[in-house]
């Protein structure tokens, strides 16, 4: 999960495995102030999961969320 520092969530580790696409309802990018660039996926249970924006599955999910 992202770590909040002064209300700015940052990620210090990424999930490597793909999450089920059907479990993800939205996403957001962490701030440029964070040391690691990250995408945060929000699951249908409102859990937040940090992912590496360079991973293929992450890019694929972002594209599909944008289109839906």
């Amino acid at each position: 999960s992202p770590y909040s520092s002064d209300t700015t969530p940052c990620c210090f580790a990424y999930i490597a495995r793909p999450l089920p696409r059907a479990h993800i309802k939205e996403y957001f990018y962490t701030s440029g102030k964070c040391s690691n660039p990250a995408v945060v996926f929000v699951t249908r249970k409102n859990r937040q999961v940090c992912a590496n924006p360079e991973k293929k599955w992450v890019r694929e999910y972002i594209n599909s969320l944008e289109m839906s």
């Epitope: 580790a13 999930i15 490597a16 495995r17 793909p18 999450l19 089920p20 696409r21 059907a22 479990h23 699951t43 249908r44 249970k45 859990r47 999961v49 991973k55 293929k56 599955w57 694929e60 999910y61 599909s64």
Partner: antibody, heavy 119, light 108 residues
Framework: QVQLVQSGAEVKKPGASVKVSCKVS????????MHWVRQAPGKGLEWMGG????????IYAQKFQGRVTMTEDTSTDTAYMELSSLRSEDTAVYYC????????????WGQGTTVTVSS | SYVLTQPPSVSVAPGQTARITCGGN??????VHWYQQKPGQAPVLVVY???DRPSGIPERFSGSNSGNTATLTISRVEAGDEADYYC???????????FGGGTKVTVL
């Protein structure tokens, strides 16, 4: 070093159920997503489903939906796969395999449990 | 659902290079994992994310992924490399892990 040790071989009659166990040692079960894969004699690998800890949910391959149940007992670090309404085509080696936080992919695997369905 | 196609068998002489293909529609957009399975044993991950090797896997094993084909390359093949090899991808349309049919590598 993570190790997965599975329960022993089973012989079942058609229509019965089988429950295979997979004990994790070296780490706690909470650290992993546990998946189950089967392999019929002389055939390839077939993914059955697995647990997604990030969402606290289990996903099942459509083919097995309604017939398979995957559970975990974190107090004993043991995962279970139960398959019901067995038929002869379910004769296979059943593997548990972990999907660790890193690297991606299934590694390591249990040694496999042979399930034979025969009348 | 997503289909992965592998040749049933590949034969190679010791010291030569074996190339095992895994075909799928626009597979380059997916991360491909490769497993080695020796007779009577559980599969072992040999390549993940197209081309990365887990620790303990020899450098002789390498992977690539472009267009509609991913390839596992085994250079300087040894007798101990004789095994079945499976490719695997995550299909986000079905939320399923998908395996190829497997390729039996025979060392002549």
């Amino acid at each position: 070093q993570v190790q997965l040790v599975q329960s022993g071989a089973e012989v079942k009659k058609p229509g019965a159920s089988v429950k295979v166990s997979c004990k994790v040692s070296g780490y706690t079960l909470n650290d992993f997503a546990m998946h189950w894969v089967r392999q019929a004699p002389g055939k390839g690998l077939e993914w059955m489903g697995g647990y997604v800890p990030e969402d606290g949910d289990t996903i099942y391959a459509q083919k097995f939906q309604g017939r398979v149940t995957m559970t975990e007992d974190t107090s004993t670090d043991t995962a279970y796969m139960e398959l019901s309404s067995l038929r002869s085509e379910d004769t296979a080696v059943y593997y548990c395999a972990t999907d660790p936080l890193y690297p991606p992919g299934l590694s390591p695997w249990g040694q496999g449990t042979t399930v034979t369905v025969s009348s | 659902s997503y289909v992965l196609t592998q040749p049933p068998s590949v034969s190679v002489a010791p010291g030569q290079t074996a190339r095992i293909t895994c075909g799928g529609n626009n597979i380059e957009s997916k991360s491909v994992h490769w497993y080695q399975q020796k007779p009577g044993q559980a599969p072992v991950l040999v390549v993940y994310d197209d081309s990365d090797r887990p620790s303990g896997i020899p450098e002789r094993f390498s992977g690539s992924n472009s267009g509609n084909t991913a390839t596992l390359t085994i250079s300087r093949v040894e007798a101990g490399d004789e095994a079945d090899y499976y490719c695997q991808v995550w299909d986000s349309n079905t939320d399923h892990w998908v395996f190829g049919g497997g390729t039996k590598v025979t060392v002549l």
